[in-house]
Interface confidence: low
C-alpha cells in the first residue's frame, strides 16, 4: 500500500487551531511536475457533504512530502469529508477522513466501519441532542432509509446492512429529519473486496495474517498497518509518536500523537494513534490495553509488563506478543514441507528462524537438490524471528526435489528439508472447436488437450479477423464452459487461439494452435408486402409495408426500398435500418415522375426476395401557366394584366405571382404577388410615363407552376416620375367597364 | 446461517409460571432487538414483547404487561420470556424473532414452542 | 392501538392466476408496513418490508405497494408453494399489531 496518512487534529475547542497534514513517505513524493509524477493534493470534497461557503482553506506545503490544510474560522468549516490524493500512476491513492460534529444531534459510536465482502455491517448513531423526529439514513448523499424516532435502542439508532458488497462502500449519514444536515452523524463504510482473510482478483489467496490491528489489502494482500505499528504484518512496534510505514514519521507537538486522528489508505480508515483513544483521541488507554485506539489487549506472562503504545514488555529469557515462549537454540519456524513453482519462474522463498543469540541474515541458508548452496538477499528482523528472503534462480524441471534451510548460531543449529516441485505450464495440443456460428457470434468450446501440468486455473481465448494485423481481442472464460465471441463482423474469418494458465506465478502457458472460424448470416428468406403509399408532396412519399408473420426470430438488419425511374434510368435506393420499421419516408424525389417501388429485407450483405412491384406517380412541381396573358397601357403610370386561368389544374390555386422588368433594363426583376387566386385581372400601378416594361405569371399550388408567356406594354405620355409599381386587383370585367 | 431455536414450552395449570428460552446463532445476537410474537391455535399472530440490544429497553402487549418479562444474556446469545400467572388465553405456539433494523421487520424466526395453559 | 383489517379473508385461485392482497390501517401508517408468509406448521417469513422493498431471497413474483391506510401485496403468478396464509404488519406505533390473516388456497 502506498505510505500516505492523513492526521487530523482535533483540538476543537478552536477551530482557528485545527489543521489536517497530509504526509507521504513514499519516495519522490509530492515533488510536483518533476519525474517523480504528481503533487499531493488536500482537500474539502463537497461532494457529499456540502457546508456553508466561507473564506477559502490555506494550504501549506512543508517540503516535497507533507501538505497542512488551515483557515478554519468557524465549527461548521470542520463537518465532512476530506481527502488527500498521493502517490504517482497506478500506486495513486485516496485517504479520506470524515469529520462529525462534536455538537450534534446524533454521534457515530464509530466513525469507519471496514468490513468483508458478505459480512453484516451495523452503523450506530448516538443520541446526543434528542428530536422527535424520523431519523433519515443516507448514503452517498441519497436517501437509503427511514427510522422513527421510537425505534431508537438504548439511545441509539441502528442501521443493519446484510451482505454488503464493495459498490455499498461510501460516506453515510444519521439526520433527524428537518435538522441541520451539519447535525449528522457520519460514517464510512469500507467494505474489502474479498471475504475474510483472502485477497485477489478471485479473492483466492490468503492473507498473512495482519497483526496489531492491521488490515489486508484485498488487491495486494499487503497488511495496511496502524499507525505506530510497522513490517510486513504489522508485528513491530514503532517507538511512542512515530508512525509511517517505517516510523519514519514523527507526531508534532510536545504530546506527541494526543489528539489526533490518523488516516490510512482503505481498506484501514482512520482511528487514533497507538495508545490513546475517544472520540477526540485525547484518552490514554486503560491498563492492559494498547495500540490504535486502545483496541488491543496485553495479556502478558512471565512477567511482562504493558506498554499502551507497544504492549507486552518481556523480560530476559522471555519474547513472543505475550512474553510466553521462551529464547532458545534456533530453530527453523513455519516452514511449508512443500512448495510449488511453475518452470522458469524466479520465486523468492523465506525461511523464519528464532534463536539466543537472535539469527542474522549470513546465519540462514538454502541449499538446493544438486548441492548449491543460495544465501539471502534481505532479512526482516522482526522481535520473535529472523526471516530470509531467497532470490531463487530462474527454475529448471531438474530443481524438483527436497531443498532444505539450515540455520547456525554460536547457540546450535537447526534445519528443514522440504518438497519443491517445479510445474510446466500448460500448453494446447489442439484448437479450439467451434459449435454454433450466427452473423455477429461465435460460439466456442475452449477445453482442449494439452500437455505440462494442470489444474487449469485460468483459460484465455485470444481472437482477430483472419489476416488481421490489429491486436488480439482475448477474453478470459471458465474451463468448463463453453464461450460465446460477441459482436463481431458478419461473414467474416477470426482466427481463434487458446491459451492457458495453470495456478501461481508464471503459470500462463504458451499460445495453442490457431483455428480458423467464420462467422454466418444466412440468407433473409420472408418476402415483404407493399401495404400502401401516399403523396405528401410533389417530391414526398410515404410507404408502408408488412411482413409474412412467421414463428421464432426475425432474421434480418434492415429494408432495403427501390425507386425506379424508367424515364430517366435511375434507381433509388433507401436504407432504413431497423428490421422492425414498416413504414418510411422518402423525400427529394422528382415531382411529376412515374417511379416502379419495390421493398426488400436485407441481412448482413445478402438480400432477400422483393416485394410485388408498385407503380407510383407523383404530382408535377407546380400548376401550368395562365393563359392568354395580355398588357394594356391605361395612363402614364398604370398597366392592367387579363389572363385566363390554367387548364388542368391538380389542385386549387393559392396564389399568382407576376414579374414586371423595364425593357432591356439591367436590374432584378420585381416580384409581385396576386393573392386572390379567383381573380383574372390586376392593374399594375407606379410605372414610370413612357416606359416600355416586360411582364410574365405563374401560378402556385404546393409550388411555383410554369412561367406564362412574356408580354410587352409601355405606359402613356410625359408624367412625373413615379415611385415605383405596384398592384391592384379587380374583377376583368370591372376593369374593362371602367 | 442464522438459527433462533425456542425450548421451555409446554403443559401448565391456570396461574403458573414457565420461562421460556430461545438460543441465537449465525448473527451479532448483541446488536439485534429481539421479540417474542404468539400465535394461539387457528388464529393470526400476536406480538407479546421486544427488548433493545443491550436488554436496557424493554415494551410489552396489554396483554401481557405485568404478567411477562423478558431479558436477554448477550454473553450467552440467549433471549428469555418469563411468563407469571398463566392465563387459558395465554395457549399458543410462542416464536421468537430477530429484527432486520431498529424495528423494521422481523426477517428471522424461531419454529417455535407451543404453551398450554389449562386445568 | 392500530387495527389492520385484511382481506379478502380467503382467496382461491390457480397456480398461474394473479393473486392481488389488501391490507388497510385504522389510522396513516405511512410505508411502515411489512407482509409475511405462513405455511401450515411452520413460523412466517418476511416477505415485503416498509411496503414495498422485498426481503433477501424473496422471488420477484411478490411486490408490495402502498402508503397510509391501504397497500396491497400482489403475487404475479401463483407457484404452487405460494398457497399459504399471509399477513400484514405495522411498525408505525406501539403496540406492533398484525392484520387477521388472508389464505390464498388451491381453487
Known amino acids: 500500500a502506498v505510505d500516505l496518512t492523513l492526521l487530523a487534529n482535533l483540538r476543537l475547542t478552536d477551530p482557528q487551531r485545527f489543521f489536517l497534514t497530509c504526509v507521504s513517505g513514499e519516495a519522490g513524493a509530492g515533488r510536483g511536475s518533476d519525474a517523480w509524477g504528481p503533487p499531493l493534493l488536500l482537500e474539502k470534497d463537497d461532494r457529499i457533504v456540502r457546508t456553508p461557503p466561507g473564506p477559502p482553506l490555506r494550504l501549506a506545503r512543508n517540503g516535497s512530502h507533507q501538505v497542512t490544510l488551515r483557515g478554519f474560522s468557524k465549527p461548521s468549516d470542520l463537518v465532512g469529508v476530506f481527502s488527500c490524493v498521493g502517490g504517482a500512476g497506478a500506486r495513486r491513492t485516496r485517504v479520506i477522513y470524515v469529520h462529525n460534529s462534536p455538537g450534534a444531534h446524533l454521534l457515530p459510536d464509530k466513525v469507519t466501519h471496514t468490513v468483508n465482502k458478505g459480512d453484516t455491517a451495523v452503523l450506530s448513531a448516538r443520541v446526543h441532542k434528542e428530536k422527535q423526529t424520523d431519523v433519515i439514513w443516507k448514503s452517498n448523499g441519497s436517501y437509503f432509509y427511514t427510522l422513527d424516532w421510537h425505534e431508537a435502542q438504548d439511545g441509539r439508532f441502528l442501521l443493519q446492512l446484510p451482505n454488503v458488497q464493495p459498490p455499498s462502500s461510501g460516506i453515510y449519514s444519521a439526520t433527524y429529519l428537518e435538522a441541520s444536515p451539519l447535525g449528522s452523524a457520519f460514517f464510512r463504510l469500507i467494505v474489502r473486496g474479498c471475504g475474510a482473510g483472502r485477497w485477489g482478483p478471485g479473492c483466492t489467496k490468503e492473507c498473512p495474517g495482519c497483526l496489531h490491528g492491521g488490515v489486508c489489502h484485498d488487491h495486494d494482500g499487503e497488511c495496511v498497518c496502524p499507525p505506530g505499528f510497522t513490517g510486513t504484518r504489522c508485528e513491530q512496534a514503532c517507538r511512542e509518536g512515530r508512525f509511517g510505514q517505517s516510523c519514519q514519521e514523527q507526531c508534532p507537538g510536545i504530546s506527541g500523537c494526543r489528539g489526533l486522528t490518523f488516516c490510512l489508505p482503505d481498506p484501514y480508515g482512520c482511528s487514533c494513534g497507538s495508545g490513546w483513544r475517544g472520540s477526540q483521541c485525547q484518552e490514554a488507554c486503560a491498563p492492559g490495553h494498547f495500540g490504535a485506539d486502545c483496541r488491543l489487549q496485553c495479556q502478558c506472562q512471565n512477567g511482562g509488563t504493558c506498554d499502551r503504545f507497544s504492549g507486552c514488555v518481556c523480560p530476559s529469557g522471555w519474547h513472543g506478543v505475550h512474553c510466553e515462549k521462551s529464547d532458545r537454540i534456533p530453530q527453523i519456524l513455519n516452514m511449508a514441507s512443500e512448495l510449488e513453482f511453475n518452470l522458469e519462474t524466479m520465486p523468492r522463498i523465506n525461511c523464519a528462524a528464532a534463536g539466543n543469540p537472535f539469527p542474522v541474515r549470513g546465519s540462514i541458508e538454502l541449499r538446493k537438490p544438486d548441492g548449491t548452496v543460495l544465501l539471502s538477499t534481505k532479512a526482516i528482523v522482526e522481535p520473535e524471528k529472523t526471516t530470509a528472503e531467497f532470490e531463487v534462480p530462474r527454475l529448471v524441471l531438474a530443481d524438483s526435489g527436497f531443498w532444505e534451510c539450515r540455520v547456525s548460531t554460536s547457540g546450535g543449529q537447526d534445519s528443514r528439508r522440504f518438497k519443491v516441485n517445479v510445474k510446466v505450464p500448460p500448453v494446447p495440443l489442439a484448437a479450439p472447436r467451434l459449435l454454433t456460428k450466427q452473423s455477429r457470434q461465435l460460439v466456442v468450446s475452449p477445453l482442449v488437450s494439452f500437455s505440462g501440468d494442470g489444474p487449469i486455473s485460468t483459460v484465455r481465448l485470444h481472437y482477430r479477423p483472419q489476416d488481421s494485423t490489429m491486436d488480439w481481442s482475448t477474453i478470459v472464460v471458465d474451463p468448463s464452459e463453453n464461450v460465446t465471441l460477441m459482436n463481431l463482423r458478419p461473414k467474416t474469418g477470426y482466427s481463434v487461439r487458446v491459451q492457458l494458465s495453470r495456478p501461481g506465478e508464471g503459470g500462463e502457458g504458451a499460445w495453442g494452435p490457431p483455428t480458423l472460424m467464420t462467422t454466418d448470416c444466412p440468407e433473409p428468406l420472408l418476402q415483404p408486402w407493399l401495404e400502401g403509399w401516399h403523396v405528401e408532396g410533389t417530391d414526398r412519399l410515404r410507404v408502408s409495408w408488412s411482413l409474412p408473420l412467421v414463428p421464432g426470430p426475425l432474421v434480418g438488419d434492415g429494408f432495403l426500398l427501390r425507386l425506379w425511374d424508367g424515364t430517366r434510368g435511375q434507381e433509388r435506393r433507401e436504407n432504413v435500418s431497423s428490421p422492425q420499421a414498416r413504414t418510411a419516408l422518402l423525400t427529394g424525389l422528382t415531382p411529376g415522375t412515374h417511379y416502379q417501388l419495390d421493398v426488400q429485407l436485407y441481412h448482413c450483405t445478402l438480400l432477400g426476395p422483393a416485394s410485388p412491384p408498385a407503380h407510383v406517380l407523383l404530382p408535377p412541381s407546380g400548376p401550368p401557366a395562365p393563359r392568354h396573358l395580355h398588357a394594356q397601357a391605361l395612363s402614364d403610370s398604370e398597366i392592367q394584366l387579363t389572363w385566363k386561368h390554367p387548364e388542368a389544374l391538380p389542385g386549387p390555386i393559392s396564389k399568382y405571382v407576376v414579374e414586371v422588368q423595364v425593357a432591356g433594363g439591367a436590374g432584378d426583376p420585381l416580384w409581385i404577388d396576386v393573392d386572390r387566386p379567383e381573380e383574372t385581372s390586376t392593374i399594375i400601378r407606379g410605372l414610370n410615363a413612357s416606359t416600355r416594361y416586360l411582364f410574365r405569371m405563374r401560378a402556385s399550388i404546393q409550388g411555383l407552376g410554369d412561367w406564362s408567356n412574356t408580354v410587352e406594354e409601355s405606359t402613356l405620355g410625359n408624367g412625373l416620375q413615379a415611385e415605383g409599381p405596384v398592384q391592384e386587383s379587380r374583377a376583368a370585367e370591372e376593369g374593362l367597364d371602367q | 446461517e442464522v438459527q433462533l431455536l425456542e425450548s421451555g414450552g409446554g403443559l401448565v395449570q391456570p396461574g403458573g409460571s414457565l420461562r421460556l428460552s430461545c438460543a441465537a446463532s449465525g448473527f451479532t445476537f448483541s446488536a439485534y432487538p429481539m421479540f417474542w410474537v404468539r400465535q394461539a391455535p387457528g388464529k393470526g399472530l400476536e406480538w407479546v414483547s421486544v427488548i433493545s440490544p443491550s436488554g436496557g429497553q424493554t415494551s410489552y402487549a396489554d396483554s401481557v404487561k405485568g404478567r411477562f418479562t423478558i431479558s436477554r444474556d448477550n454473553s450467552k446469545n440467549t433471549l428469555y420470556l418469563q411468563m407469571n400467572s398463566l392465563r387459558a388465553e395465554d395457549t399458543a405456539v410462542y416464536y421468537c424473532?430477530?429484527?432486520?433494523?431498529?424495528?423494521?421487520?422481523?426477517?428471522?424466526w424461531g419454529q417455535g414452542t407451543l404453551v398450554t395453559v389449562s386445568s | 392501538d392500530i387495527q389492520m383489517t385484511q382481506s379478502p379473508a380467503t382467496l382461491s385461485l390457480s397456480p398461474g392466476e394473479r393473486a392481488t392482497l389488501s391490507c388497510r390501517a385504522s389510522q396513516s401508517v405511512r410505508t411502515y408496513l411489512g407482509w409475511y408468509q405462513q405455511k401450515h406448521g411452520q413460523a412466517p417469513r418476511l416477505l415485503i418490508y416498509d411496503a414495498s422493498n422485498r426481503a433477501t431471497g424473496i422471488p420477484a413474483r411478490f411486490s408490495g405497494s402502498g402508503s397510509g391506510t391501504d397497500f396491497t401485496l400482489t403475487i404475479s403468478s401463483l407457484e404452487p408453494e405460494d398457497f399459504a396464509v399471509y399477513y400484514c404488519q405495522q411498525r408505525s406505533n406501539w403496540p406492533l399489531t398484525f392484520g387477521g390473516g388472508t389464505k390464498v388456497e388451491i381453487k
Open positions: 424473532a430477530k429484527s432486520f433494523s431498529g424495528l423494521a421487520a422481523l426477517d428471522f
